[in-house]
Interface confidence: medium
């Protein structure tokens, strides 16, 4: 059954643009008007999970790419990852826990909250070329993003 | 409150064509998936398949070359063909509303018709 | 075809816990659900998404998933626990329910 989706950037609170460095890793960094055409643009489905007034299941795929987010654990830690998946399976209303995420939105920005680790956001560290991760909402990390809607 | 109801043939002879249709009372149609179940006499219960709004099916891939789940939006209704059935389709079938308020699982059932194949 | 496998049946003493489990390849990775059935009416929802109650199910059901197991517990088992209780899962593009597990109330 086609499943909804809609296509986003995403850039965190402060305007850091994300960006595929290696084949399986997102960094964030501050773009300008050359090289803005570099950052992800994220295939935003809506699958299974327990939506609510604040918080929407979704999973974030990255456009043109066989690539999700995924949070996973290793070594004791919940990890964010970028996982490669087989393109006539995905993406389904019905996904693997590990790649929902809770859109959460607060005022006028979004939060992604993993589904399989509560109180575990999509982060970005203050520092400019660091790898986006899953942080448990502690420290200076940014979790909050704005949502910038891309035509089909 | 919503509700299914459901409505077909009882009883038929091998080889023939299960027939069975759902009418859903209450809710919006095109916001939930729409399915059939079905229990065989003693038995546990097997997902037959499902249908959107739109008529986009997933089905039981046991199944798949002998079902046929349409819809019909303007009626609020939904229906299940099941060809050439034999006496191992004989079950209750049910329908069943997927909601994406619960997780897309099967939140309403309609009541249950028994199917018996029989010569 | 994919398999969700539950023991047939569970004995429990009223006012004592009954546990049913479901087993299946990497059942922890999705959700699972639980319904029951008393003889002769349709399946009623449980618990979904692992561990969620629907409105109107008593607290004394609850839920887990990890691993390859899924468990549905019932605290304080009353006589009116007494049914077939199915587990629910997805396997790909279709939907596996578990075999049915029979608790009675001794």
């Known amino acids: 059954v086609p499943i909804r989706q809609l296509h986003y950037r995403l850039r965190d609170e402060q305007q850091k643009s994300l960006v595929l460095s290696d084949p399986y890793e997102l960094k964030a960094l501050h773009l300008n008007g050359q090289n803005i055409n570099q950052q992800v643009i994220f295939s935003m489905s809506f699958v299974q999970g327990e939506p609510s007034n604040d918080k929407i299941p979704v999973a974030l795929g990255l456009k043109g790419k066989n690539l999700y987010l995924s949070c996973v654990m290793k070594d004791g830690t919940p990890t964010l990852q970028l996982e490669s998946v087989d393109p006539k399976q995905y993406p389904k209303k019905k996904m693997e826990k590990r790649f929902v995420f809770n859109k959460i939105e607060v005022k006028s920005k979004v939060e992604f909250e993993s589904a399989e680790f509560p109180n575990w956001y999509i982060s970005t560290s203050q520092a400019e070329h660091k790898p986006v991760f899953l942080g448990n909402n502690s420290g200076q990390d940014i979790i909050d993003f704005t949502m910038e809607s891309v035509s089909s | 409150q919503v509700q299914l109801q459901q409505w077909g043939a009882g009883l038929l002879k091998p080889s023939e064509t299960l027939s069975l249709t759902c009418a859903v009372y209450g809710g919006s149609f095109s916001d939930y998936y729409w399915s059939w179940i079905r229990q065989p006499p003693g038995k546990g219960l097997e997902w037959i398949g499902e249908i959107d709004h739109s008529g986009s099916t997933n089905y039981n891939p046991s199944l798949k070359s002998r079902v046929t789940i349409s819809v019909d939006t303007s009626k609020n209704q939904f229906s299940l063909k099941l060809s050439s059935v034999t006496a191992a389709d004989t079950a209750v079938y049910y329908c069943a509303r997927a909601s994406p308020s619960s997780g897309w699982t099967l939140d309403y059932w309609g009541q249950g018709t028994l199917v018996t194949v029989s010569s | 075809q994919s398999v969700l496998t539950q023991p047939p049946s569970v004995s429990v003493s009223p006012g004592q816990t009954a546990s049913i489990t479901c087993s299946g390849d990497?059942?922890?990775?999705?959700?699972a659900f639980w319904y029951q059935q008393k003889p002769g009416q349709s399946p009623v929802l449980v618990i979904y998404l692992d561990n969620k109650r629907p409105s109107g199910i008593p607290e004394r059901f609850s839920g887990s998933n990890s691993g390859n197991t899924a468990t549905l517990t019932i605290s304080g088992t009353q006589a009116l626990d007494e049914a077939d209780y199915y587990c629910?899962?997805?396997?790909?593009?279709?939907?596996?329910f578990g075999g049915g597990t029979k608790v009675d109330i001794k």
């Open positions: 990497k059942l922890g990775d999705k959700f």
């Open positions: 629910y899962a997805w396997a790909d593009t279709y939907e596996v």
